[in-house]
């Protein structure tokens, strides 16, 4: 059963229904809400069968409604319950106040019932103009808002309404006057130079969009120079001014189309910078030293012109860093008058030119570099020089082909000669000499020298002389020769010359098969690419042939006899005896004896028989001349 339907208001736009029902399983409830005077169609709601209460929102304020409800169980409708109730009156806004007023904005506060409005509609209108109002909406939960973008010193009417879906409250209004635009603070000039100045000013932070600076020459009607700078700046460099000139500088702030009253300041730029006190002094014979004074302004650079007084066409220009106050100018002619000019450059401006004249000193002289006493590994140098000036002389020795390391000698300024040694033979050199005196080095003078050639081929030596030949040896520079030619000629020029060609690596030749005991001339030449050296020569006589002599027979017996002989000492390796009967009736007897022997007893022969005896020596495989004798054995 459905009963106890009660209806209570829920604010001005809603009703709350409560009912009771047995805890059967209602499928759902049907609720009908209708204005009592039936102006609008009824609203029907279906709610779940488990509910026993429901809110009905979105109704009209202060309006009587008839509410009826029935339940549905298994398609069966319960009897309808009805009740009547009215919605409450619409809420009104409380009060509106202006909490803060600035020159371009204000803060609006108001009161209102909680949750009553979806949003608030605020209108901002200049009081005395027909300009369109500014409209804005703010969420219904807010009770305060900022209104920016207003004009300074202006009357505004501000209205506010609370708005729900279909209802707007009676507007509340308030009138307000915005404040004046704030004034600028102080304008000062903090730095002044000849072509620029720096402005500083004070102002409330974040007030201005931008500042306008106007720079005007005080006594001129020329167009002013205007600059616009961001509102965040409090300082500004004003470049490009004229030196020694009075200027009026004005500054005003701008904010949303409003300009402050201008601030003004008068200032005079400084006079043009000048260079002062140019001094020129000599730095030896080939240079000058310049000193000058200048204010410590940031000179970009100095331009110096150096010119021989008598040669206006050939000037030397130098550009130097602006930090310098002195410079050496080298590379000038000795004993020459020069005119030196200087000007400084600051931000494109040239200072007036300063000039001075000075002469370089007379050049100390060196000359007559001479090379003498050349050997394969050394030479002597001599030269002339101005006395009493030089501290040291520098000698550089460079080989013309640049294959060797440069050798440098530093010797006393009192010397006029030098001995250069340890050089390679057959080498071309260039000798450079310069003198050093305090702060100067003379021009370098030079001479050429070539060390003599070493003998490429030398020390022809004859050794191992024997009756049939000898050994020829020589010395030669490594890799100097492609080949050697050894020529052997007998001293009497009776025989044809013998020529032997040897490779360039060989250094000796053993000669054999020559004639004993005669004179020979030996010549050795080297060949380089077909070019022949002058020959080395030597003369030699071959030894006489070693002799065996004085073959004697003694002490004859029936079967033999004793033989003795003489021979050159230390020549023979051994001796050979040949013995045969003169009638050739028996085989010959041949005996080989060792070299030291000079006698031999012969036995085993036939009695009373005549024998022919031959003896020769053997030396290095060659036989000496044979000596002979006849011997007869005794009767038995």
């Amino acid at each position: 059963e459905l009963e106890n339907l009660t209806v209570t208001e829920v604010g001005w736009d809603g009703l709350r229904l409560n009912w009771t029902a047995a805890d059967q399983a209602y499928e759902h409830f049907i609720i009908q809400v209708q204005e009592a005077n039936k102006v609008e169609a009824a609203r029907n709601l279906t709610v779940p069968g488990s509910l026993r209460a429901v809110d009905i929102p979105g109704l009209k304020a202060a309006t009587p409604y008839t509410v009826s409800i029935y339940g549905v169980i298994q398609g069966y409708r319960t009897p309808v319950l009805s009740a009547e109730a009215s919605t409450g009156e619409t809420p009104n806004l409380g009060e509106v106040v202006v909490a803060e007023v600035g020159w371009d904005a204000l803060k609006l506060n108001w009161t209102a019932p909680e949750g009553a409005y979806e949003y608030f509609f605020i209108q901002v209108q200049e009081a005395d103009t027909v300009e369109a109002a500014q409209n804005l909406t703010v969420p219904g939960g807010l009770r305060s808002t900022d209104l920016p973008g207003l004009k300074a010193a202006t009357h505004y009417t501000i209205t506010i309404r609370g708005v729900t879906q279909d209802f707007s409250t009676t507007p509340l209004s308030v009138e307000v006057l915005t404040e004046e635009v704030p004034d600028m603070g102080n304008l000062t000039v903090t730095e002044v130079s000849w072509d620029a100045l720096r402005l500083n000013w004070t102002t409330p932070d974040g007030t201005y969009d931008q500042f306008t600076i106007q720079v005007q020459e005080a006594d001129q009607v020329e167009e002013a120079h205007n600059l616009t700078v961001p509102g965040s700046l409090r300082s500004m460099e004003i470049p490009g001014l004229r030196a020694g000139t009075p200027y009026t500088v004005t500054l005003h702030g701008e904010v949303r189309g409003h300009s402050t009253r201008p601030l003004a300041v008068e200032v005079v730029t400084e006079d043009l910078p000048q260079l002062g006190d140019l001094a020129v002094s000599e730095v030896g014979w080939d240079g000058l030293r310049l000193n000058w004074t200048a204010a410590d302004n940031a000179y970009e650079h100095f331009v110096i012109q150096v010119q021989e007084v008598n040669k206006v066409e050939a000037a030397q220009n130098l550009t130097l860093p602006g930090s310098l106050r002195a410079v050496d100018i080298p590379g000038l002619e000795a004993a020459t008058p020069y005119r030196v000019s200087i000007y400084g450059v600051i931000r494109g401006y040239r200072t007036p030119v300063l000039s001075a004249e000075a002469s370089t000193a007379k050049e100390p002289e060196i000359g007559n570099l001479n090379v003498s006493d050349i050997t394969p590994e050394s030479f002597n140098l001599s030269w002339m020089a101005t006395d009493g000036i030089f501290e040291t002389f520098t000698i550089e020795i460079i080989d013309s082909n640049r294959l060797l390391e440069t050798v440098e000698y530093n010797i006393s300024g009192a010397e006029r000669t030098a001995h250069i040694s340890g050089l390679p033979p057959s080498t071309d050199f260039i000798v450079y000499l310069s003198g050093l005196a305090p702060s100067i080095r003379t021009k370098t003078i030079s001479a050429t020298a070539t060390t003599e050639a070493l003998p490429l081929l030398e020390n022809l030596t004859i050794s191992d002389i024997n009756p049939y030949g000898f050994t020829v040896s020589w010395m030669a520079s490594e890799n100097a020769f492609d080949s050697f030619l050894v020529t052997v000629v007998d001293s009497g020029k009776l025989l044809d010359p013998q020529e032997f060609t040897l490779s360039g690596t060989q250094r000796k030749l053993e000669l054999r098969g020559l004639i004993t005991g005669i004179g020979y001339e030996v010549m050795v030449s080297g060949f380089t690419q077909g070019h022949q050296t002058k020959p080395l020569r030597a003369e030699i006589v071959t030894e006489a042939e070693p002799e065996v002599d004085n073959l004697l027979v003694s002490d004859a017996t029936p079967d033999g006899f004793r033989l003795s002989w003489t021979a050159d000492e230390g020549v023979f390796d051994n001796f050979v005896l040949k013995i045969r009967d003169t009638k050739k009736q028996s085989e010959p007897l041949e005996i080989t004896l060792l070299a030291p022997e000079r006698t031999r007893d012969i036995t085993g022969l036939r009695e009373a028989t005549e024998y022919e005896i031959e003896l020769y020596g053997i030396s290095k495989g060659r036989r000496s001349q044979t000596v002979s004798a006849i011997a007869t054995t005794a009767m038995g």
Epitope: S426, E452, A453, P455, L456, L457, S477, E478, N479, A480, D482, S483, L485, T501, F527, T528, Q529, G530, H531, Q532, T533, K534
Partner: antibody, heavy 118, light 107 residues
Framework: EVQLLESGGGLVQPGGSLRLSCAAS????????MGWVRQAPGKGLEWVSA????????YYADSVKGRFTISRDNSKNTLYLQMNSLRAEDTAVYYC???????????WGQGTLVTVSS | SELTQDPAVSVALGQTVRITCQGD??????ASWYQQKPGQAPVLVIY???NRPSGIPDRFSGSSSGNTASLTITGAQAEDEADYYC???????????FGGGTKLTVL
Amino acid sequence: EVQLLESGGGLVQPGGSLRLSCAASGFTFSGSRMGWVRQAPGKGLEWVSAINEEGGQTYYADSVKGRFTISRDNSKNTLYLQMNSLRAEDTAVYYCAKHPPHRPFDYWGQGTLVTVSS
Amino acid sequence: SELTQDPAVSVALGQTVRITCQGDSLRSYYASWYQQKPGQAPVLVIYGKNNRPSGIPDRFSGSSSGNTASLTITGAQAEDEADYYCNSSHGPRRPVVFGGGTKLTVL
């Protein structure tokens, strides 16, 4: 009759290359040392390079070392001079010449002109 | 040049003329002598101590003393008018060197 005939000369730009050849006849080429001598216009003779009989040993003047290469092909009786990185000062008539072991250059070709110019 | 020659020498027809060549290498090596006529290749005229290739007239002779080599033409002929170059070796580093040449004029 000994004959040496050079070829391969011509006009070349500085930095360019040329290869000279010398065809030999009338003597035992493989038994002779060979060489190149040049003569700049209106100037004296300047030895350039030489090579031994088998080609295993080569010799160069300092002025051409590292730029010129001498070689020979005994099977073709031909001598070569490969010239790289040519300079204006290499402009000359280049002569091919032979020499026996114990005699300097005894036969010369008629020469080929090399002009190095841009 | 490592071998130094006089640039020009003249001789009357039939007279004797001596052309010299100086250089350190000539202390060790004999000079060789070449004759070159305009537009022609050089021709060897003297080599070694005093050797003439076949076909070279015997009026040409060579000699050497110290660092000087000489080419002598005894009874100069009109056809001897030419440039003469001395030639030698300077050892392994400079195996062939030429003198600067001497222009011989036969008057």
